[in-house]
Interface confidence: medium
């Protein structure tokens, strides 16, 4: 059945080489004395990408990251030695790994690093305007980085700088045991989560922090932290990880008598990302890896995209789940998790909840308390012992929108772009993996907006070596994606419409919301350009409907490529044909010489079909003819290639090979007659040449044959050799051999 495509595979798979050759990736391959390009800060206004790395901070031009400035910020020799004496790795740990890089004000950034297990922070001057071209470290103003950056570069940190205050989730000690959510800087006393209480935080791995408004009153603003942590005893049998969302009020200043300088509004809830399984057992994706907030229209209600992986070492899988803030708020307004002792199960708290409800921000909106310091003692006591909610937050549609379980990689990062297409708005996800690839995925509504279909558009390799993607930023202004890893930074466009093909159908089949057929090419779609010729169908990707009135040859596509190739009787030959689209199914037809009828090729011992093409073994004269390679996708058939195979009989080849350079055939005839079959080694030599990886040898061989042939024709004008026309074709065809300068413009090789 040719109708069924392969939806779980990327339509286009581009290697790093193909990305480079088609000018679709720009890479900064790092400095010799740096690494770990993990901390990104995008500044669209200045058109800069600031990147924190090992001992360096970079300022890349968003237009082209090859254009950059750098600040060197290493640690002193003394610090490095102390770190080494503490038993740490001199290269991987005893350096200044930048973990925090935030906009502090109009003129400065705030940066913190591990400082060789001695966290340190400072300010970076960037000037008032982009044209100031300032990028320098404030050497006179270093600050203690405790509670801002971890000591250990392996530990994750989530931070957010708003109104001169830094919120950070990190480890505050050398041993990496005292994890907390802190608020530092600013004019107020520092605040933190409760210490030494696993109910608050239990060995967390912080992912990100975001400010989200609750109402039009800024007093209600909350900071949300996304993290994963060990499940608390009794919450789960055995050791398990749970993904979490935590909230704190921006105007929380701690308690008066209890929870002094500690958060009084901290609450956390579990994020569920699972697939319902047989026997009611769900497959859980619990290891939260990254979060992206899609702010659209209403900043109070962003859509939360989370990237998750499985905890199991046996079953490796990744998923993307979407959450709505209304669901998150509903959970935080629901029952608190409660248990009476360490051996009891967690249950929803049934008793009286004190007023104002713990977790509510002190404001005019929800009650008459001006400050958390005024909160009644029973509220503080309750908040301290009930930091977790009983109900989890379920994803929209109760299931992931993207799942990958049958691959050798796992998801690590995500950014999302909302794109206006002809038939609506689509969220295009760019998902980074632990092998240095980026997946471009579009979620397409089926019957309802909630019921989404994932379409994997592209899989792009963006780094030369497989390396985990650890940071990603998307510039809507530049329409570019920026990717960070241990090895370096990469930049690629959000869309490459031209690579989908040169036909309306190919453009339509791509289902890329960025692209549409403009009448002559697949190009960037702009909703403002009101042109009736724009063809696009993201929802269905149906070229038969959208491209049927465009009368081109060959099923509304361009003419197929035509090739002539030569095979030797009893040898094997390979007809290469693989469509650009990995989703297309290929089938072959054969048309005998001088016949109209085409028959579908059946696979047997004589013909073997592979993903790359067709292998014909032990060639016979009857195999001569036309071979047509067709791609079928979404009901649309396209002829990619027409190969004319000429099978050369052994006798003619022998004659060709044994002609003398002077054109006198008598010597050859004589030799041929006197040779025993075992002495006829020419055929073996010929096959050796065909199979030789060094094509130049083949070129030289053919060159000799043509030279002889030309000489023969010059010396005997009246003589027309039986098959010389075939060799003429071969000679002409030689120039057209595909040397695969563009890997994705695949075509058969001709000998």
């Amino acid at each position: 059945n040719y109708q069924n495509g392969k939806n779980n595979v990327p339509r286009l798979k581009l290697s790093y080489k193909e990305m480079l050759e088609s000018n679709n990736v720009i890479t900064f391959n790092g400095l010799a004395n740096s690494s770990s390009y993990h901390t990104f800060l995008l500044d669209e206004e200045r058109s800069r990408l600031y990147v924190g790395a090992k001992d360096h901070i970079f300022s890349f031009d968003l237009v082209n990251i090859k254009d950059f400035q750098k600040i060197v910020w290493p640690v002193s020799y003394t610090r490095r030695d102390e770190c080494k004496w503490a038993g740490k790795d001199i290269l991987k740990e005893c350096a200044n790994f930048i973990k925090v890089l935030k906009a502090y004000n109009q003129t400065h950034l705030y940066a913190c690093g591990t400082g060789a297990f001695h966290p340190i922070c400072t300010y970076i001057e960037i000037g008032h305007h982009p044209e100031d071209n300032i990028f320098k470290l404030e050497n006179s103003h270093f600050e203690n980085g405790r509670g801002k950056s971890p000591y250990d570069p392996k530990l994750l940190t989530a931070s957010l700088l708003i109104d001169g205050e830094l919120y950070s989730g990190t480890a505050a000690d050398f041993m990496g045991r005292d994890f907390a959510i802190f608020r530092t800087l600013g004019h107020h006393h520092p605040i933190r989560t409760e210490q030494h209480d696993s109910r608050w935080l239990n060995d967390p791995k912080f992912i990100s922090a975001h400010l989200i408004s609750e109402s039009d009153n800024p007093e209600d603003d909350k900071v949300y932290f996304f993290f994963r942590e060990n499940a608390i005893d009794g919450e789960h049998s055995g050791k398990a990880t749970h993904a979490r969302i935590g909230q704190i009020c921006k105007n929380d200043f701690g308690g008066h008598r209890s929870l002094v300088n500690k958060w009084t509004t901290f609450l956390k809830a579990r994020l569920i990302c699972s697939v319902p399984g047989p026997n009611g057992i769900d497959t859980h994706f619990d290891e939260l890896q990254d979060v992206f907030l899609m702010n659209f229209k209403d900043p109070k209600n962003p859509v939360v995209y989370g990237v998750f992986t499985t905890s199991s070492n046996i079953f490796k899988g990744s998923a993307v789940c979407m959450y709505s803030m209304s669901d998150v708020r509903r959970v935080f307004l629901g029952p608190y998790a409660h248990r009476d002792g360490p051996n009891y199960q967690w249950v929803p708290y049934q008793g009286r909840v004190p007023y104002p409800r713990p977790g509510t921000c002190p404001s005019k909106t929800f009650g008459g308390f001006d400050s958390t310091k005024d909160l009644p003692d029973d509220v503080i006591t309750f908040a301290r012992s009930h930091p977790a909610m009983y109900n989890p937050v379920f994803p929209m549609n109760n299931r992931p929108i993207v799942i990958k379980t049958d691959v050798n990689y796992q998801f690590t990062q995500i950014v999302v772009d909302r794109v206006d297409a002809e038939d609506g708005q689509y969220d295009v996800m760019f998902i980074g993996t632990d092998v240095g690839t980026v997946l471009k995925v579009v979620s397409i509504p089926k019957e309802t907006w909630y019921d989404l279909e994932e379409v994997l558009l592209e899989e792009m390799t963006v780094f030369r070596e497989p390396t985990a993607i650890s940071a990603m930023e998307l510039s809507t202004k530049q329409q570019q994606l920026y990717i960070g890893s241990t090895a370096g930074v990469a930049q690629l466009p959000l869309h490459r419409c031209d690579i989908y093909g040169k036909a309306c159908a190919e453009c339509c089949l791509a289902r890329d919301p960025y692209c549409a057929w403009d009448g002559s090419a697949c190009s960037r779609y702009f909703p403002t350009a009101k042109r009736r010729t724009r063809r696009q169908d993201i929802r269905n990707g149906d070229p038969l409907t959208h491209c049927s009135d465009l009368h081109h040859d060959n099923h509304h596509g361009h003419s197929p490529e035509e090739r002539i190739i030569y095979g030797v009787e009893n040898s094997s030959t390979f007809l290469e044909c693989s469509p650009k689209s990995q989703r297309a199914l290929v089938y072959w037809q054969f048309q005998r010489r001088n016949e109209e009828r085409k028959e579908e090729i059946r696979v047997d011992d004589h013909i073997i079909r592979t993903d790359q093409g067709l292998l014909l073994r032990s060639l016979q004269q009857k195999d001569s003819g036309n071979y047509l390679c067709h791609a079928v996708e979404h009901g649309f058939i396209q002829t990619l290639l027409k190969v004319t195979l000429e099978v050369i009989d052994t006798e003619h080849l022998e004659e060709l090979l044994h002609k003398d350079d002077d054109g006198d055939g008598s010597k050859t005839k004589e030799m041929s007659n006197s040779m025993t079959p075992s002495q006829k080694v020419w055929y073996r030599d010929f096959m050796q040449l065909i199979n030789h990886p060094n094509l130049n040898t083949m070129d030289e061989f053919c060159e000799q044959v043509w030279k002889r042939d030309r000489k023969q024709r010059r010396q005997r004008p009246g003589h027309t050799p039986g098959n010389s026309n075939k060799w003429k074709h071969l000679q002409e065809n030689k120039k057209g051999r595909n040397r695969r300068t563009h890997e994705f413009e695949r075509a058969p090789r001709s000998v």
């Epitope: 503490a86 001695h118 000690d173 050398f174 210490q195």
Partner: antibody, heavy 123, light 111 residues
């Protein structure tokens, strides 16, 4: 007014045991980290042990590890120090001190101290 | 032998200014840990005098001030008075798994 009152000190033979208590009042005892600090006659101050508000974190000076046990009863607003295998060098005035977190929550100061109780280890 | 080093004694006449130093290392004061100062009047319990290197708790006269630089800290007392005669202790934390450490103490004599 914050008050810390130590008791339980006295004369004990080497190898013997004592249990010190510290009764707290004037503040929310269950919210604070508490410590024991000692001072040998004519000598300086030495931190002995600390305990977090919920007993989730407990730490000891190397010199007393394995011999002393710190504990608390929040319902009674009382801090304890169980001292076993006492040695002559444990002779000191033992102070109960509250962790203040006045400047930061990393490195608390001791913002309130009791008057101390004398422990003498001698045969 | 204390981890933090203080001069055993200092003295000054009433009205004078005296400073007491507290020298640590890169694993305590130099590691960014806070420094606190305590005053112990004869026969009494210690009392918090300065916290976080330079902050005074309420009730402590502004004649007392503290500072910190690198691996050391200092306490300054201006306008010396007879009632300032006492033992002064600095404290910090010793890493990497921090625990409280005290200086050996400095006896201040008002001449």
């Amino acid at each position: 007014e914050v008050q810390l009152l130590e008791s339980g000190g006295g004369l004990v033979q080497p190898g013997g045991s004592l249990r010190l208590s510290c009764a707290a009042s004037g503040f929310d005892f269950s919210s604070y980290e508490m410590n024991w600090v000692r001072q040998a006659p004519g000598k300086g101050l030495e931190w002995v042990s600390g305990i977090s508000w919920n007993s989730g974190w407990i730490d000891y000076a190397d010199s007393v590890k394995g011999r002393f046990t710190i504990s608390r009863d929040n319902s009674k607003n009382t801090l304890y120090l169980q001292m076993n295998s006492l040695r002559a060098e444990d002779t000191a005035v033992y102070y109960c001190a509250r962790s203040g977190y006045s400047s930061s929550w990393f490195d608390p100061d001791f913002d309130y101290w009791g008057q101390g109780t004398l422990v003498t280890v001698s045969s | 032998q204390s981890v933090l080093t203080q001069p055993p004694s200092v003295s000054g006449a009433p009205g004078q200014r005296v400073t007491i130093s507290c020298t640590g290392s890169s694993s305590n004061i130099g590691a960014g840990y806070d420094v606190h100062w305590y005053q112990q009047l004869p026969g009494t319990a210690p009392k918090l005098l300065i916290y976080g290197a330079s902050n005074r708790p309420s009730g402590v006269p502004d004649r007392f001030s503290g500072s910190k630089s690198g691996t050391s800290a200092s306490l300054a007392i201006t306008g010396l008075q007879a009632e300032d005669e006492a033992d002064y202790y600095c404290s910090s934390y010793e890493g990497p798994n921090p625990y409280v450490v005290f200086g050996g103490g400095t006896k201040l004599t008002v001449l």
